[in-house]
């Protein structure tokens, strides 16, 4: 991407990603330099009759680096520290073309859970305090709670009152989502409130 705005590329932790490189049409490329956070990553000299010379200059990422036939950069077994700014400089006889990228590493969401801190009032109304979580959540994970297609909360937590005398069976669903995955987990208000009711009657005996 040669505009001022870098191309944003998402990578998934542990998987592979390709930063696509576009060549100047019809021009012979002298060499290509790939940079990561302004530090040299690799230096490539293409040859018309034999394999290109590839000099990997960053040993940290070296074993995980590969290049396609068009010299796009492939990075495998992605780590969080691969996040950052990448640039490719293509030098021809007449010009130098710059492509910029921002690589963002995201986690596949895993292990969604709901914890319940609910209480039963003397009028038998059940107040549900539910908290949703996923493993290793970061700022780019969005949580919401839904019931019957309506959003009840835009946070990991949900506080809601449920009265079994006037409410029908109700499921509450937590949805956790980021740019590469989403998970959901549903809980039954009736079941949660019955559990609270059992605890409540046990403590009264």
């Amino acid at each position: 991407q040669s505009s001022l705005t870098p191309l944003m590329v998402n990578g998934i932790l542990g998987e592979s990603v390709t930063l696509p490189l576009e060549f100047p049409a019809g021009e012979k490329v002298n060499f290509i330099t790939w940079l990561f956070n302004e530090t040299s990553l690799a230096f490539i000299v293409p040859h018309e009759t034999k394999s290109p010379e590839i000099h990997v200059t960053n040993p940290k990422q070296g074993k995980r680096l590969n290049f396609t036939q068009s010299y796009s950069l492939q990075l495998s077994n992605l780590k969080m520290e691969d996040t950052g700014s990448y640039r490719a400089q293509i030098s021809t006889k007449t010009s130098a073309k710059l492509s910029s990228y921002t690589l963002r590493i995201l986690r596949q969401l895993r292990n969604i859970q709901v914890t319940n801190h609910s209480q039963l009032f003397q009028n038998m109304t059940c107040e549900l305090h539910l908290t949703c979580s996923v493993e290793d959540a970061d700022d780019n994970v969005s949580f919401r709670w839904e019931a019957l297609g309506n959003t009840l909360s835009s946070q990991p937590n949900l506080t809601v009152s449920w009265d079994p005398r006037i409410s029908s069976e109700q499921d509450y669903t937590c949805i956790a989502e980021n740019a590469v995955s989403n998970l959901s987990f549903s809980v039954s208000a009736q079941k949660l409130c019955e559990d609270v009711k059992i605890q409540y009657t046990d403590t009264k005996m």
């Epitope: 998402n10 963002r104 969005s142 949900l158 980021n178």
Partner: antibody
């Protein structure tokens, strides 16, 4: 119905502080996050950050780390924005906006104009 | 951060005309997390369309939204005088949340 009512306009001198309030009604306050958005005169909308109204945890955009603080008083369903060491370039309308389920801003306050001038 | 580029910046249109505003993102965005707002002069912004194509409460059916990936569109089918406003797109999936630069619609 959902309503967000903000405090009135403020005229402040450079270096002073200001605290803008946003009182919510018509929904369970602790179920929906609260965003703050800045609009400088004649300019577009700029997201400042948001606060989780249940945990009190605040997230700030990079340009708003340091002099800007979000806080809550859940007992009165109110979110606050405090700006310290005010500068002329802080002159803007500040909006609170409720965070919807997919991080849309589904309800907005009427805005509070903060003018910083010596 | 994700850059949202709106086009055009400004448009002068006549009533009953069809208007299309585009929002181009610097990275692919899940359609659930792309939203549109309308802001009239001296008023707060108002949610117009959320999750790419869902009309917010009370929004007339002449407004519609579409798109996926990096390219999204707001369409006003038969423009009315009251639609004179600035329109903003916004993404909600990556921190920091970002807005487009706005498209000002003037009614001739």
């Amino acid at each position: 119905q959902v309503q967000l009512v903000q405090s009135g306009s403020e005229l402040k001198k450079p270096g002073a502080s200001v605290k803008v309030s946003c009182k919510a009604s018509g929904y369970t306050f602790t179920n929906f996050g609260m965003n703050w958005v800045r609009q400088a005169p004649g300019q577009g909308l700029e997201w400042m950050g948001w606060i989780n109204t249940y945990s009190g945890e605040a997230t700030y955009a990079d340009d708003f780390k340091g002099r800007f603080v979000f806080s809550l008083d859940t007992s009165v369903s109110t979110a606050y924005l405090q700006i310290s060491s005010l500068k002329a370039e802080d002159t803007a309308v500040y909006y609170c906006a409720r965070r919807g389920g997919t991080a849309e801003f589904d309800y907005w306050g009427q805005g509070t104009l903060v003018t910083v001038s010596s | 951060e994700i850059v949202l580029t709106q086009s055009p910046d400004f448009q002068s249109v006549t009533p009953k005309e069809k208007v299309t505003i585009t929002c181009s993102a610097s990275s692919s965005i899940s359609s659930n997390f792309l939203h549109w707002y309308q802001q009239k002069p001296d008023q707060s912004p108002k949610l117009l369309i959320y999750r790419t194509s869902k009309l917010a409460s009370g929004v007339p059916s002449r407004f519609s939204g579409s798109g996926s990936g990096t390219d999204f569109t707001l369409t006003i089918n038969s423009l009315e005088a009251e639609d004179a406003a600035t329109y903003y797109c916004q993404q909600g999936i990556y921190m920091p949340l970002t807005f487009g630069g706005g498209t000002k619609l003037e009614i001739k």
